[in-house]
């Protein structure tokens, strides 16, 4: 019962997380104009991964897509890639986990197969969550770098007379959505991996039973028979689980400092 609950909760949490990752990726407010300590402008600038927008005081909002691939900063491309990989992995993970759910019966699928699928989806959710968190963090780092760069030369004087105000950008709502969604997907994945352990059929440790035949005392241990047949699948599951743990550790960590053009 607890296993089913853990698996179900893991699925729901991951589903919410992936929906959040998709939402964050599509959102326009990855970076928003910093209004603090700036002249009050009659326009509000904000940017997403796919387009930049300007909302005027008049009520009009104009958005322009980035209709170039080569002209975009490498970091933006990297963030896009991370988010898309996260979405794809998450979507596959969701598909796999639907069939892995204990409450759903598909033909004569064994518990061991469901355990494997649960683990696979769990790992996919973990990697998906890490991709989203990494993508959002790379973008956030890029913003912080740019913010301090533009603060350093915020007012560029022209002959000491005319001033040009540089628009500074700060964290947009999409970053927080992305972080939370990535975290939820990660948590959901961990829950699926935990549920996998409970789903795998455990070795039945029967106590030795003595059968008293007339004049003879024979001890019968069925464990030996079980080991000699192909039913001892728990060992195999353990192997996959360990491999899964290794895969989690192999997820690349990204450098914290990036150049943004």
């Amino acid at each position: 019962m607890a296993v089913t609950a853990c698996q179900g909760l893991g699925f729901v949490v991951s589903l919410i997380g992936i929906a959040g990752i998709i939402a964050a990726t599509c959102m326009d407010q990855w970076s928003t104009q910093d209004l603090y300590n700036n002249p009050v402008t009659a326009v509000f600038n904000y940017q997403g991964l796919w387009r930049s927008c300007v909302r005027e005081s008049s009520g009009f909002t104009e958005c322009r897509g980035y209709f170039t691939l080569l002209g975009l900063p490498a970091m933006l491309q990297a963030v896009r890639a991370l988010m898309i990989v996260g979405i794809v992995l998450g979507a596959i993970g969701l598909l796999v986990s639907i069939f892995a759910l204990k409450c759903i019966r598909i033909g004569s699928m064994e518990d061991s197969a469901k355990a494997n699928m649960t683990l696979t989806s769990g790992i996919m959710f973990i990697v998906s969550g890490l991709c989203a968190i990494a993508g959002v963090s790379v973008f956030a780092n890029m913003l912080v770098t740019n913010f301090w760069m533009s603060t350093a030369n915020m007012y560029t004087g022209m002959g000491g007379m005319v001033q040009t105000v540089q628009t500074r950008y700060t964290f947009g709502a999409a970053l927080f959505v992305g972080w939370v969604a990535g975290g939820l997907t990660l948590i959901g994945g961990v829950m699926m991996c935990i549920a996998c352990r409970g789903l795998a059929p455990e070795e039945t440790n029967y106590k030795a039973v003595s059968y008293h035949a007339s004049g003879h005392s024979v001890a019968y241990k069925p464990g030996g028979f079980k080991a000699s047949t192909g039913f001892g699948s728990n060992t195999k599951n353990k192997k996959i689980y360990d491999g899964g743990a290794r895969t989690e550790d192999e997820v690349q960590s990204y450098p914290s400092k990036h150049d943004y053009v």
Epitope: Q33, P39, V40, T41, A42, V43, N45, Y46, Q47, S52, C53, V54, E56, S57, S58, G59, F60, E62, R64, V162, Q163, T164, V165, Q166, T167
Partner: antibody
Framework: EVKLVESGGGLVQPGGSLKLSCAAS????????MAWVRQAPGKGPEWVAF????????YYADTVTGRFTISRENAKNTLYLEMSSLRSEDTAMYYC???????????WGQGTLVTVSA | DIVMTQSPSSLTVTAGEKVTMSCKSS????????????LTWYQQKPGQPPKLLIY???TRESGVPDRFTGSGSGTDFTLTISSVQAEDLAVYYC?????????FGAGTKLELK
């Protein structure tokens, strides 16, 4: 056809109060930012106050901050300007304007005259 | 506050003549978000409210004759009337539409010779 009609102007003593109204028609009022602009006799226009479509953002000129209050009633398609502690320098023709592209004052009313005199 | 400086304060012209008037702002009116200059030109005739001519420094409002052309970027802007007509005699104002307060220039008065 966009139509803006101001009302509520008149003669008022210094220190007095007045409430101007602007009835809008011919467009979806709740979708546009609105403003009040005044013009003293023989002078150029002077922006007074701005209110966003949802009344979330409100800005005033330094000369009227704390004395004037801009508000809107989207259900009634009406813009207001409540003026208090009036001074002689507030004497002007007050125009109601609807913002357009580029935050420009795309449409103007015919104005209502406010005279502050003892 | 942004200071808008218009020059000349008045212009005496003859019909059919080409006219240019200048507007300078104390701060750049170029918005980096969309690379547009938030400067507007208005025309005001006696007894009438100002009429919008050009927004975004160079975009003509619908219904405005194409003899009116706006140009410039950053802090220096120009309004050009390619061939002045009698009905163009008015006061022309430029306005900063990027920073609050939304300041107007003092105006350029166009008069007939």
């Amino acid at each position: 056809e966009v139509k803006l009609v101001e009302s509520g102007g008149g003669l008022v003593q210094p220190g007095g109060s007045l409430k101007l109204s602007c009835a809008a028609s011919g467009f979806t009022f709740s979708r546009y930012g609105m403003a009040w602009v005044r013009q003293a006799p023989g002078k150029g226009p002077e922006w007074v106050a701005f209110i966003s479509n949802s009344a979330y953002s409100i800005y005033y000129a330094d000369t009227v901050t704390g004395r004037f209050t801009i508000s809107r009633e989207n259900a009634k398609n009406t813009l207001y300007l409540e003026m208090s502690s009036l001074r002689s320098e507030d004497t002007a023709m007050y125009y109601c304007a609807r913002l357009g592209y580029g935050n420009s004052f795309a449409y103007w009313g015919q104005g209502t005259l406010v005279t502050v005199s003892a | 506050d942004i200071v808008m400086t218009q020059s000349p304060s008045s212009l005496t012209v003859t019909a059919g003549e080409k006219v240019t008037m200048s507007c300078k702002s104390s701060q750049s009116l170029l918005n980096s978000g969309n690379q547009k200059n938030y400067l507007t030109w208005y025309q005001q005739k006696p007894g009438q409210p100002p009429k919008l001519l050009i927004y975004w420094a160079s975009t003509r409002e619908s219904g405005v004759p194409d003899r009116f052309t706006g140009s410039g970027s950053g802090t220096d802007f120009t309004l050009t009337i390619s061939s002045v007509q009698a009905e163009d005699l008015a006061v022309y104002y430029c306005q900063n539409e990027l920073f609050y307060p939304l300041t107007f220039g003092a105006g350029t008065k166009l008069e007939l010779k």
